[in-house]
């Protein structure tokens, strides 16, 4: 079967997100990948979406993230826009209404996104072969 268009969109968004650092990409998020054994793919996507939603809800108007220059402000706004798009697409892929996220291990947002990108690329290579 062909790869879902949503999956391609997710990878494209993740590529954009991991290209540049902002003042807040080193803030931490719950590392859902640290204990992801016995977790279905759909649960992983759902939890990833939940973590991203928590992040942008909490930091969208964070003064240190918005920065003090026009460039910093623009990059942060772009980051939030991409995270919202990613969140929306992950929910679509997960097909679940909600999922619990235990706040245990921590990861920086940039490491979290890199890990998610690896998972999505692996999924894409499987469905395109």
């Amino acid at each position: 079967h062909k790869c879902d268009i949503t999956l391609q969109e997710i990878i494209k968004t993740l590529n954009s997100l991991t290209e540049q650092k902002t003042l807040c990409t080193e803030l931490t998020v719950t590392d859902i990948f640290a204990a992801s054994k016995n977790t279905t793919e759909k649960e992983t996507f759902c939890r990833a979406a939940t973590v991203l939603r928590q992040f942008y809800s909490h930091h969208e108007k964070d003064t240190r993230c918005l920065g003090a220059t026009a460039q910093q402000f623009h990059r942060h706004k772009q980051l939030i826009r991409f995270l919202k798009r990613l969140d929306r697409n992950l929910w679509g892929l997960a097909g679940l209404n909600s999922c619990p996220v235990k706040e245990a291990n921590q990861s920086t947002l940039e490491n979290f996104l890199e890990r998610l990108k690896t998972i999505m690329r692996e999924k894409y290579s499987k469905c395109s072969s």
Epitope: K21, T22, L23, T25, L27, T28, V29, F55, H58, T108
Partner: nanobody, 116 residues
Framework: EVQLLESGGGLVQPGGSLRLSCAAS????????MGWARQAPGKGLEWVSW????????YYADSVKGRFTISRDNSKNTLYLQMNSLRAEDTAVYYC?????????FGQGTLVTVSS
């Protein structure tokens, strides 16, 4: 366990300088953005400055821009805040901070009093 220990606060005259230090332990310091926040008497917490791990990107509140400089020494696991041209309104408890999930982790703080 994350530990942040601030030092360098004290009493200083208007126009004077102070250098705050924050010794960090319990996590890989070089991987994380770090910052300084302050709380003046009877007021809320205000972000003063933030710096990413490489030190290449920084944020300063408008009230301190041009007077304060944030820096870090990743080999010493230490964060600094150089404060020049201090004003009475800079009087506050200054906290070293790191991100911790949806929250921020703060040290115990160091008091800076600017008075003649």
């Amino acid at each position: 366990e994350v530990q942040l220990l601030e030092s360098g606060g004290g009493l200083v005259q208007p126009g004077g300088s102070l250098r705050l230090s924050c010794a960090a332990s319990g996590f890989t310091f070089r991987n994380f953005g770090m910052g300084w926040a302050r709380q003046a008497p009877g007021k809320g917490l205000e972000w003063v400055s933030w710096i990413i791990s490489s030190g290449t990107e920084t944020y300063y509140a408008d009230s301190v821009k041009g007077r304060f400089t944030i820096s870090r020494d990743n080999s010493k696991n230490t964060l600094y805040l150089q404060m020049n041209s201090l004003r009475a309104e800079d009087t506050a408890v200054y906290y070293c901070a790191k991100s911790l999930g949806r929250f921020d982790y703060f040290g115990q703080g160091t008091l800076v009093t600017v008075s003649s």
